[in-house]
Interface confidence: low
Amino acid sequence: QLTTESMPFNVAEGKEVLLLVHNLPQQLFGYSWYKGERVDGNRQIVGYAIGTQQATPGPANSGRETIYPNASLLIQNVTQNDTGFYTLQVIKSDLVNEEATGQFHVYPELPKPSISSNNSNPVEDKDAVAFTCEPETQDTTYLWWINNQSLPVSPRLQLSNGNRTLTLLSVTRNDTGPYECEIQNPVSANRSDPVTLNVTYGPDTPTISPSDTYYRPGANLSLSCYAASNPPAQYSWLINGTFQQSTQELFIPNITVNNSGSYTCHANNSVTGCNRTTVKTIIVTELSPVVAKPQIKASKTTVTGDKDSVNLTCSTNDTGISIRWFFKNQSLPSSERMKLSQGNTTLSINPVKREDAGTYWCEVFNPISKNQSDPIMLNVNYNALPQENGLSPG
């Protein structure tokens, strides 16, 4: 059975394709190639006479075709118009004609795509953003990447328009991207430059630092306010409800008891039109709000070296305090194996080593006073090495 095979089946525009012929009969007068699925003289590309080894171009010849003695047809510099069916007619010496039809598909070399957006400055929890991958081309697969990863499954992400459009429903501040689209066809692929979203949000509720409430007269009061916001928030300070200044930081040197009161930080985002405030009470006093003695506990007080870990916990009912840890009169942590967590309330040692044995205590403090826990003793044991099995020499 006479057959043809396209090499390759999917061809890039501008490249070449070879229509290979299999099972060509032995006794031939000649053969012809036609464009289309049937023999049509008006669509003949080329004829080849075996006897004269002469190729004759037909009406459909473009000058890019070459026919070989084995009947294979080479088409160079293909265009998308070349896509389709090709029919070979073989005229055998018994005057019985045999035909075979093959096909190939020409795809364009894809350009570098770009991303267009209907809104590059959306407002958090309010706006939707539709990204469209340009250009629109036939027989093209569209893929999307967020943060260099394929699209996560999310009810807020919707693909439409044959995946050419990616819609983000109700954007959040974490949706900044970058976003990339990739276009693919069977012969090429190309990815866009990344696009980022400038998501307008906030301000969130401001945080006033430091967290201290009590100050001694004569100290300097330096408060800083921060609220997550895009664009950055504009800040102003009020003391006991009276406007003071429009700055992110408030500094009052040499404070007196008259500086006690309610300190309000006001954060405003002029784009979202939202405002948030936080109020902090400052108490300037000679009296010490005495910090109670903290309690120290250990997950275990006797451990095996190089094997066990231990957690030490410092407990206090006081608020607005800080915690620090001591071991043999030295401040901790002192090694990579020591980690502080939960606002310094927990000291973890993993693994425990011989040099970790000894006395630990914690100290709670505020700007006015401090107090230490009773010490706790950590014992570190080492198991004897196991005996090696096997025969001893000699």
């Epitope: 939707a128 009810p155 919707q158 693909l159 439409s160 328009n161 044959g162 995946n163 819609t167 429903l169 109700s170």
Partner: antibody, heavy 121, light 111 residues
């Protein structure tokens, strides 16, 4: 509890007008796209129109374009359907329905009980 | 003639599993989420399935949805007499720029 209560239905002559209202309660109305869906007697559901949560995006079924107008008043938590040039084929129970996707991939998670519009001479 | 095609009727006996199909095209089911609605006699429709296969809270897990290509289906297992109702599929259509429903399937619980 989410509640949608339609009103304004009734008997109207062909070519006449009617205004349907849908009073919403139990949720933040301005956060949701809203739709009108109708059902002719003994027939299936037919979507009529959708309006986005802020009112900026509106779509209509081809069968009602130019004759029916959807609108909303977020301050009153109310959805409206102004019906003009009414035809006999507009006879149906009209439901208002809430869309939790803000109209970007519409679906209807809460429905009113419907109000009957009869167009007849 | 509905854009989405459903069988007009389906039936089953109590305890059986019944499936209702919904056929569309790439402009609706193929590229958008499918929802299913249940309408009990004389009442307003109720959302049964959204986003192809998700169930709203309060909908029993006897109801399940699935989608493949341009077709979707609703399966009801452990059929009960109270499941007798009309069932509609729906999806946004990108070509029509509108929401389309199937013609509805009347489910009868026999016996």
């Amino acid at each position: 509890e989410v509640q949608l209560l339609e009103s304004g239905g009734g008997l109207v002559q062909p070519g006449g007008s009617l205004r349907l209202s849908c009073a919403a309660s139990g949720f933040t109305f301005s956060n949701y796209a809203m739709s009108w869906v109708r059902q002719a007697p003994g027939k299936g559901l037919e979507w009529v129109s959708v309006i986005s949560h802020g009112g900026g995006s509106i779509y209509y079924a081809d069968s009602v374009k130019g004759r029916l107008t959807i609108s909303r008043d977020n301050s009153k938590n109310t959805l409206y359907l102004q019906m003009n040039s009414l035809r006999a084929e507009d006879t149906a129970v009209y439901y208002c329905a809430r869309d939790p996707t803000k109209g970007y991939a519409p679906l209807f998670d809460y429905w009113g009980q419907g109000t009957l519009v009869t167009v007849s001479s | 003639q509905s854009v989405l095609t459903q069988p007009p009727s389906a039936s089953g006996t109590p305890g059986q599993r019944v499936t209702i199909s919904c056929s569309g095209s790439s402009s609706n089911i193929g590229n958008n989420y499918v929802s299913w609605y249940q309408q009990l006699p004389g009442t307003a429709p109720k959302l049964l399935i959204y986003a192809d296969s998700r169930r709203p809270s309060g909908v029993p897990d006897r109801f399940s949805g699935s989608k493949s290509g341009t077709s979707a289906s609703l399966a009801i297992s452990g059929l009960r007499s109270e499941d007798e109702a009309d069932y509609y599929c729906g999806a946004w259509d990108l070509s029509l720029n509108g929401y389309v429903f199937g013609g509805g399937t009347k489910l009868t619980v026999l016996g």
